[in-house]
């Protein structure tokens, strides 16, 4: 399971696509900035084992995939870029799932991470709530796009965990 290299390559491609997806100038959206509280302190203060890192990364990518697979998202972004971005995320999910099976075994599920997974879910709930409150405005989506890019690059400790032998 050569995850570190493939994941980092796919991650970079996803970030490039996300960067290209902007439709309006973010300069007009300063007043829409919002504190989503990505749980970076929890992540930074923890040494993730490989299986833990895989399951938390899987949750982050799954939640991002869900967020960008909604009808509201389809209306907000250029369709071909959105499709490429979603495909990239879907392939990352497949890579991670294949790794989980290889690392843990088919039957076993890494449940030692429930707190981290819950933190990720709550974070995405805050993002979804913000979009709803802002009525899925173009600026709200711009702010969310910037936030997702930031959270993707914040998950360095998780990526370190991918390189660790359990």
């Amino acid at each position: 399971c050569d995850l570190p290299q493939t994941h980092s390559l796919r991650n970079r491609r996803a970030l490039i696509l996300l960067a290209q997806m902007g439709r309006i100038s973010p300069f007009s959206c300063l007043k829409d900035r919002h504190e989503f509280r990505f749980p970076e302190e929890e992540f930074d203060g923890h040494q993730f084992q490989k299986t833990q890192a895989i399951s938390v990364l899987h949750e982050m990518i799954q939640q991002t995939f869900n967020l960008f697979s909604t009808e509201d998202s389809s209306a907000a972004w250029e369709q071909s870029l959105l499709e490429k971005f979603s495909t990239e995320l879907y392939q990352q999910l497949n890579d991670l799932e294949a790794c989980v099976i290889q690392e843990v075994g088919v039957e076993e599920t890494p449940l030692m991470n429930e707190d981290f997974i819950l933190a990720v879910r709550k974070y995405f709930q805050r993002i979804t709530l913000y979009l709803m409150e802002k009525k899925y405005s173009p600026c709200a989506w711009e702010v969310v796009r910037a936030e997702i890019m930031r959270s993707f690059s914040f998950s360095t400790n998780l990526k370190k965990g991918l390189r660790r032998k359990d």
Epitope: K31, D32, H34, E35, A146
Partner: antibody, heavy 121, light 107 residues
Framework: EVQLVQSGAEVKKPGESLKISCKGS????????IGWVRQMPGKGLEWMGI????????AYSPSFQGQVTISADKSISTAYLQWSSLKASDTAMYYC??????????????WGQGTLVTVSS | DIQMTQSPSSLSASVGDRVTITCRAS??????LNWYQQKPGKAPKLLIY???SLQSGVPSRFSGSGSGTDFTLTISSLQPEDFATYYC?????????FGQGTKVEIK
């Protein structure tokens, strides 16, 4: 360590052109915007404009629109401020500073050391 | 453009004094306000962002408060290194604008 390093002091004559630089290091250059701020001798801070190095999108203060050009070369993590025809009133210290864009993070948390531009005949 | 007005424009104080600087915006800026400190010949340094968040590495004697149009920077016990010029800046919309500055001098 995050650093913004600006080019050295310049002495120019009125009518001459000039391009000063601001090189970022220790962070992802395209993840932050770069703003430019002017401080005339003995005066306060004036925001001139800003650039998103990821796509070179720019915004200017109306006071500086058409007077200066802000650009960036992301391949070398450098932002620029340029004049095509300097005036004596352009004499000032010019600072670049890092801005988090739309992220909820401190504005202008790191600054360059400043570039002193003197325009005199 | 949003106008930012600081008061006073200068003040004299002694080491140990409690110092308060105010900043008023010409329209509501929610909590999108930053405070900077600048010493002669140096670049400005961020002290407070989003009206009340203390920037990493800044001593806890500095604090910020306010929202809407009225904001305050407080130095609870002035230290020798705090003699400088302080600027507020709104960050809710372009063009970004600074206050004219408040110079804190030794009494």
């Amino acid at each position: 360590e995050v650093q913004l390093v600006q080019s050295g002091a310049e002495v120019k004559k009125p009518g001459e052109s000039l391009k000063i630089s601001c090189k970022g290091s220790g962070y992802s250059f395209t993840s932050y915007w770069i703003g430019w701020v002017r401080q005339m001798p003995g005066k306060g801070l004036e925001w001139m404009g800003i650039i998103d190095p990821s796509d070179s999108d720019t915004a200017y203060s109306p006071s500086f629109q058409g007077q200066v050009t802000i650009s960036a070369d992301k391949s070398i993590s450098t932002a620029y401020l340029q004049w095509s025809s300097l005036k004596a009133s352009d004499t000032a210290m010019y600072y670049c500073a890092r801005h988090p864009g739309l992220n909820w993070a401190p504005d202008f948390d790191y600054w360059g050391q400043g570039t002193l531009v003197t325009v005199s005949s | 453009d949003i106008q930012m007005t600081q008061s006073p424009s200068s003040l004299s104080a002694s080491v140990g004094d409690r110092v308060t600087i105010t900043c008023r915006a010409s329209q509501s800026i929610a909590e999108f306000l930053n405070w900077y400190q600048q010493k002669p010949g140096k670049a400005p340094k961020l002290l407070i962002y989003f009206a009340s968040s203390l920037q990493s590495g800044v001593p806890s004697r500095f604090s910020g408060s306010g929202s809407g149009t009225d904001f305050t920077l407080t130095i609870s016990s002035l230290q020798p290194e705090d003699f400088a010029t302080y600027y507020c800046q709104q960050s809710i919309d372009f063009p970004l604008t600074f206050g004219q500055g408040t110079k804190v001098e030794i009494k």
